[in-house]
């Protein structure tokens, strides 16, 4: 549903995108994810900030929490207890890392219509959550876990050894948060709230990254983060489970680690409760090609957790690392022992398998030269998942239902034909028992969110259709977008090309390559966006291309694992190959080609500029990795192995940006980094700059004081303005 192309007579009334449009978020879209609280009810925050409960079946809605109450504590978030008697209100949000933040929490009693006053929560809290049933509270404060049976009760302290930057209970340390769990929490309630499982991370021996935070004081302060870089000492993890009904009875019980995992360095990768007395833990060797899924049962007689070897399932990769970006998690069926899981089939495509006894006897549920991406929900008779099967476009996502109650199982695409032109990239959110679900379509047209009956798949109502955005875009000359593929030496390179509004194939245009290219990433997706590159095409007349080369995801293991132990080679080669193919198309001005990328993309763009091909006139690297020895162990070693002589040290050394400093002499290079980047440390750019200076190579640079990897706030505006000037100068475009 992009606005239709107009006739020339109307074109005078239309305008190009401006940089201001982008920086102001003028053309941002909304999505609607219901906050499900039952099979047929959900909560949603209304435009005027009331928290409203909607009942799909009765069609009724009422305000469960007034905006007056939200405002009284400046609440920015809320959470309803499952018994619906209490709501926590979250305020004083203070960001830490990607997912983590601290906040002040207030508990509002919905039955009495007032805040709970007795035994108030301490502040700031690192994580807080309700039990899945009733209104027990678990929270983490100063790296220790506390339990409340009721919000007004005094807390029970579960752990006592928590210490800043040393021992983390119930929350991950930096590397587990960013590279393994992708959450701010590391505690998990059992389905009925009987038990609470939690991880303890011991960072005592991890080397610390230290950097200055300049602030406003006379002396900068130093930020210290235990951060294991490649090959360094890793956190030591233990998993405990406590009975929350009688927490003081036997206290926390440790869950045993499978012997084959415990024999060397290892990671804990996820925990999935199956029933109140059965839990599934996933472990991973430090060399991340062996993963073990371990199902453990509660032994009432001993009050311990037993993980028999017969309930250990091994997942191993012989061609790369285990899993995609992460090892997939199991979705258990109603028998509480068998489960569904996505892993590579014999042809090297990630597919859904059903495991009843052993992995060897797994029944393959989906198959084909495409990939299953996510299992949303398993009910008694259906399995809902997403894949990129439809019409062989890897950058699409459709939702499918497989009937598992009948034999043979039948498959139905729920979304493929709903709004075919507008919607080709979906995600979904399901209510209890998949009675209803919301579909959120991200494009390629204007995003739309809809509500559906889980039995018939019938659309019930539109939740959000972005009408205001649609109207706002009516007089905007948006660029054209196309997604196509290049076939090169048995490799398929999918690309997205963003073309100026009055694109004419007979003319020559400057080309900007936008690259990320990290392992298991995907840039070429059928999604809607009005962003910086849209502006560059619309107003500045550039052609922008995004290319998914080797190492990218959802096209099979051959492409994905091609970069295993060899980062920085094929990703760069494939960007260069694509550029050559684009030149052959005849509309690219080969004297005006640039490349830019952020993070991993900054690494690839830097290497591409230093490739010595002479293809690129200029390029930008934002917060790039410059040497894999500087990046996090969990991420880096997954793809590169260890930086040791007997492993892969040689490629660690010859894949650095610094090693290619000389090659920057004939390109215009803009290097950008935030000084407070906790993720890709400023060290990376500092070392590039040092190498360039030592090689007497001229370059441009911009640092952002006290900014992290996201370069947010006012820095964002400055960044894109600065990059725009740089590119316009490079392409000889008038300001």
């Amino acid at each position: 549903l992009r606005p239709p192309r107009v006739h020339n007579s109307e074109e005078n009334t239309m305008r190009a995108l401006t940089l201001k449009d982008i920086l102001n978020g003028t053309f941002s879209y909304k999505t609607f994810f219901p906050n499900w609280i039952s099979g047929q009810e959900y909560l949603h925050q209304s435009a005027d900030n009331n928290i409203v409960l909607y009942n799909i079946e009765t069609g009724q809605s009422y305000t469960i929490l007034s905006n007056r109450t939200m405002k009284s504590v400046n609440a920015s978030n809320y959470g309803l207890s499952p018994d619906r008697q209490f709501v926590y209100l979250e305020s004083d949000y203070s960001k830490l890392w990607r997912y983590s933040y601290t906040a002040t929490y207030y508990i509002y009693d919905l039955s009495n219509g007032e805040f709970v006053r007795g035994n108030e929560l301490p502040r700031p809290i690192q994580y807080l959550c309700w039990s899945p049933v009733g209104s027990k509270l678990a929270y983490v404060y100063q790296n220790n876990i506390y339990l409340k049976q009721r919000p007004g009760d005094p807390p029970f302290q579960i752990t006592f050894n928590g210490r800043e930057n040393k021992i983390f209970n119930g929350i991950p340390d930096w590397v587990y948060e960013e590279e393994m769990l992708a959450t701010k929490y590391a505690l998990w309630w059992s389905p009925n709230g009987k038990f609470l499982a939690y991880a303890e991370f011991n960072d005592t021996d991890i080397p610390v990254i230290a950097y200055s935070y300049y602030g406003d004081e006379q002396y900068p302060r130093t930020i210290n983060i235990p951060y294991p870089k490649a090959g360094a000492k890793n956190p030591f993890v233990r998993i405990f489970i406590i009975d929350t009904t009688y927490p003081a009875y036997v206290g926390p019980q440790e869950v045993p680690v499978p012997a084959m995992i415990a024999s060397s360095d290892y990671y804990f990768s996820w925990l999935t409760w199956v029933t109140d007395e059965r839990v599934c833990l996933q472990w991973l060797k430090r060399v991340q090609n062996v993963s073990v899924l371990s199902i453990c049962d509660f032994r009432e007689d001993w009050q311990t957790w037993d993980c028999p070897k017969t309930q250990e399932h091994i997942e191993e990769s012989r061609t790369g690392w285990a899993g995609g970006f992460f090892v997939s998690t199991p979705v258990f069926s109603y028998d509480a022992i068998s489960y569904y899981k996505i892993f590579s089939d014999k042809d090297g495509y990630k597919h859904i398998h059903y495991i009843k006894d052993t992995v060897e006897n797994a029944i393959q549920i989906t198959s084909g030269k495409w990939e299953a991406i996510n299992i949303f929900r398993v009910t008694q008779d259906s399995l809902f998942y997403s894949s990129n099967e439809f019409e062989d476009y890897p950058g699409r996502r459709n939702i499918y239902r497989i009937s598992i109650g009948s034999y043979p199982p039948s498959k139905k695409c729920v979304t493929c034909h709903l709004r075919k032109e507008r919607c080709q990239y979906y995600t979904a959110s399901f209510s209890d028992y998949a009675k209803y679900y919301a579909l959120v379509c991200y494009g390629p047209g204007i995003p739309i969110s809809t509500l559906h009956d889980g039995r018939t798949d019938q659309e019930i109502k539109i939740l959000e259709e972005n009408k205001e955005l649609e109207n706002a875009l009516k007089n905007i000359q948006l660029p054209k977008e196309e997604i196509k593929k290049l076939e090169v030496d048995e490799i398929t390179l999918w690309y997205k090309m963003i073309l100026p509004p009055q694109f004419d194939r007979s003319k020559k245009y400057p080309l900007l390559i936008q690259v990320y290219g990290g392992p298991c990433s995907q840039s070429v997706r059928s999604v809607f966006a009005v962003n910086w590159i849209s502006y560059l095409a619309s107003k500045e007349g550039m052609v922008i291309a995004l290319v998914d080369g080797r190492g990218t995801a959802f096209q099979g293991d051959k492409l994905l694992y091609a970069v295993y132990r060899k980062l920085g080679v094929y990703e760069v080669e494939d960007q260069i190959t694509a550029v050559r193919k684009f030149i052959e198309m005849g509309f690219i001005d080969e004297k005006r080609i640039a490349i830019w990328g952020w993070s991993y993309g900054g690494y690839v763009s830097s290497l591409a500029l230093a490739s010595g091909t002479g293809l690129f006139k200029c390029g930008i690297a934002v917060a790039p990795v410059s040497s894999w020895e500087y990046y996090a162990s969990v991420y880096t070693e997954r793809f590169m192995g260890l930086p040791t002589k007997d492993d892969n040290l040689e490629h660690y050394k010859n894949s650095t940006v610094m090693a290619r400093a000389e090659y920057f002499r004939n390109v215009d290079y803009l290097l950008i980094h935030g000084t407070a980047d906790d993720n890709v440390h400023f060290q990376n750019s500092a070392q590039i700059a040092k190498a360039l200076v030592n090689a007497q190579v001229d370059f441009q640079a911009m640092w952002y004081s006290d900014q992290n990897h996201g370069l947010s706030g006012l820095s964002t505006n400055h960044l894109y303005t600065h990059m725009t000037h740089f590119l316009k100068q490079c392409f000889s475009l008038s300001d």
Partner: antibody, heavy 124, light 113 residues
């Protein structure tokens, strides 16, 4: 003038149930929670529970949990309190009272208006 | 649960004299965030429902004569009738509304000496 008018006196046998109503008027029903308090002969006032008319969520004194059910009919601006498995010790005057909803964090209100009371006698 | 204890159980005061009733709670009723004490005083005459006199320990409900005053904070509170009138004969209850369950004192009976 605000009014909370309760149903009439009841005589019940042990083991039976009683349902007392409290009809309110002359104020905005949804701005106040309704509470039930009882007073046995010569005893102190005892809080039984309360309900928020906005969402129908009750809160009970643990002592009565499982035996008491408090409900509300917002269209009739009426609250109900049902007590089951009656025993002789439940003989008391049962009062309903209103308490302003505290939207703000610093608020908190006492029970400012009470019903006239309903005598429930439990006798075999 | 917060236990409320009143003293004395009964009190006989001459007309026009001062009557003082004490109330002690088993835990503090002072809310640090707003420095308010969540304590109320009620008057109950025979055959009638309780009537709110004082809330937040010391704030008089509208329409309540100014001879009634409340004081105290934390765990110790006092209701004072500065000059007892004949219509003040009743049972007086203190009640905490700091946390649930709401609890009342056992009552103090005020009579004319």
């Amino acid at each position: 003038q605000v009014q909370l008018v309760q149903s009439g006196a009841e005589v019940k046998k042990p083991g039976a149930s009683v349902k007392v109503s409290c009809k309110t008027s002359r104020y905005t029903f949804t701005e106040y929670t309704i509470h039930w308090v009882r007073q046995a002969p010569g005893q102190r006032l005892e809080w039984i529970g309360g309900i928020n008319p906005n969402n129908g969520i009750p809160n009970y004194n643990q002592k009565f949990k499982g035996r008491v059910t408090i409900t509300v009919d917002t269209s009739a601006s009426t609250a109900y309190m049902e007590l089951s498995s009656l025993r002789s010790e439940d003989t008391a005057v049962y009062y309903c009272a209103r308490r302003r909803i505290a939207y703000g964090y610093d608020e908190g209100h006492a029970m400012d208006y009470w019903g006239q009371g309903t005598l429930v006698t439990v006798s075999s | 649960d917060i236990v409320m204890t009143q003293s004395p159980d009964s009190l006989a005061v001459s007309l026009g004299e001062r009557a003082t009733i004490n109330c002690k709670s088993s835990q503090s009723l002072l809310y640090s965030r707003n420095q308010k004490n969540y304590l109320a005083w009620y008057q109950q005459k025979p055959g009638q429902p309780p009537k709110l006199l004082i809330f937040w320990a010391s704030t008089r409900e509208s329409g309540v004569p100014d001879r009634f005053s409340g004081s105290g904070f934390g765990t110790d509170f006092t209701l004072t009738i500065s000059s007892l009138q004949a219509e003040d004969v009743a049972v007086y209850y203190c009640q905490q509304y700091f946390s649930y369950p709401l609890t009342f004192g056992q009552g103090t009976k005020v009579e004319i000496k």
